[in-house]
């Protein structure tokens, strides 16, 4: 556009001046004037600002509270917040990962479709015909029923989604 119809992208308007914003990692100490430039200062230890800004205070880094099952996944810098994740066996309750819950186990009759991560819970699926799960587990998939035929055995008891088939010897004809 010619002439400009606003301050430039990294500027803000104050007292008829287009002043430079402070860059990420710095906070505003004083606005620019006709005589002076914008004054910015780096954020302190354990503080950050992640955008071009005119904030007078930096944000505190997130605290990963071990009492809530949290641990640091990525340490914060002056330009980025700390990223928390959950301890082994736990996952975040929200995208912000402010607390953790124990991974869900898949009940008998269900197998693990997707193993849980630090940010997502276990995904279970019902065992289809031909498969079973007889344990409550956060890791076990549905197992296929045993193939009696390949062992030269016959099915003595049919399998279910919770139990394997029971194989037994074939009936022999008596002479």
């Amino acid at each position: 556009p010619e002439p400009p119809t606003a301050c430039r992208e990294k500027q803000y308007l104050i007292n008829s001046q287009c002043c430079s914003l402070c860059q990420p990692g710095q906070k505003l100490v004083s606005d620019c004037t006709e005589f002076t430039e914008t004054e910015c200062l780096p954020c302190g230890e354990s503080e950050f600002l992640d955008t071009w800004n005119r904030e007078t205070h930096c944000h505190q880094h997130k605290y990963c509270d071990p009492n809530l099952g949290l641990r640091v996944q990525q340490k914060g810098t002056s330009e980025t917040d700390t990223i928390c994740t959950c301890e082994e066996g736990w996952h975040c309750t929200s995208e912000a990962c402010e607390s953790c819950v124990l991974h869900r186990s898949c009940s008998p009759g269900f197998g693990v479709k997707q193993i849980a991560t630090g940010v997502s819970d276990t995904i279970c699926e019902p065992c289809p015909v031909g498969f079973f799960s007889n344990v409550s587990s956060a890791f076990e998939k549905c197992h296929p029923w045993t193939s009696c035929e390949t062992k030269d055995l016959v099915v003595q008891q049919a399998g279910t989604n919770k139990t394997d088939v029971v194989c037994g010897p074939q009936d022999r004809l008596r002479a």
């Epitope: 002439p3 301050c7 914003l21």
Partner: antibody
């Protein structure tokens, strides 16, 4: 205090290229557009174009399209102007200048509040 | 391109004189005009922007006026350090052109 310090004088042959640098200090480099202006010996001022130091996007005067390239390196707060296929009439002092914008009566008024000291580029065979 | 014509091109004056320089634009540019002072071997220095606003640190003897196509730079009482070349610049339409300059010399 704001300072724009340019690279030293250059002597080039016709057809060659020249790259002039402009190092900024005393302000947030990416916050202000940088312009290039040249002045032939004993002549007036000629506007060449500008660069947005944040995005790196340049805008060139039509006269220089295809011959001029404006770039920047934000890590060292430096803007560059490269002019190719030099001719004798490109002999001039090349200046970088920072844009200031004033808001008044509902309008945004630009001007050039700080200038580099100038770089003399002589094109001669 | 918008043409800016300054008059006069040369001006001889004495210390204490009131000096007026005119800048005419080939088409209306509202108040998108700046004035610069340049001394030999030096970079231009911003004096006035938005046609009439004095740049910080510039002595109040300098003033600017005008709008549309006709603008003036006035030095109310010329001082020894004011002998220089003065340029107007339009910032209304690309390319942002300059006037040809007015050289103020000592009489």
């Amino acid at each position: 205090q704001v300072q724009l310090v340019q690279s030293g004088a250059e002597v080039k042959k016709p057809g060659a290229s020249v790259k002039v640098s402009c190092k900024a200090s005393g302000y947030t480099f990416a916050g202000y557009y940088m312009y290039w202006v040249r002045q032939a010996p004993g002549q007036g001022l000629e506007w060449m174009g500008w660069i947005n130091p944040d995005s790196g996007a340049p805008t060139y005067a039509q006269k220089f399209q295809g011959r001029v390239t404006m770039t920047r390196d934000t890590s060292i707060s430096t803007a560059y102007m490269e002019l190719s296929r030099l001719r004798s009439d490109d002999t001039a002092v090349y200046y970088c200048a920072r844009e200031k914008i004033y808001y008044g009566s509902g309008n945004y008024y630009p001007s050039f509040d700080y200038w580099g000291q100038g770089t003399l580029v002589t094109v001669s065979s | 391109d918008i043409q800016l014509t300054q008059s006069p091109s040369f001006l001889s004056a004495s210390v204490g004189d009131r000096v007026t320089i005119t800048c005419r634009a080939s088409q209306g540019i509202s108040s998108y005009l700046a004035w610069y002072q340049q001394k030999p071997g030096k970079a231009p220095k911003l004096l006035i922007y938005a046609a009439s606003t004095l740049q910080s640190g510039v002595p109040s003897r300098f003033s600017g006026s005008g709008s549309g196509t006709e603008f003036t730079l006035t030095i109310s009482s010329l001082q020894p350090e004011d002998f220089a070349t003065y340029y107007c610049q339009q910032l209304w339409s690309y390319p942002w052109t300059f006037g040809q300059g007015t050289k103020v010399e000592i009489k």
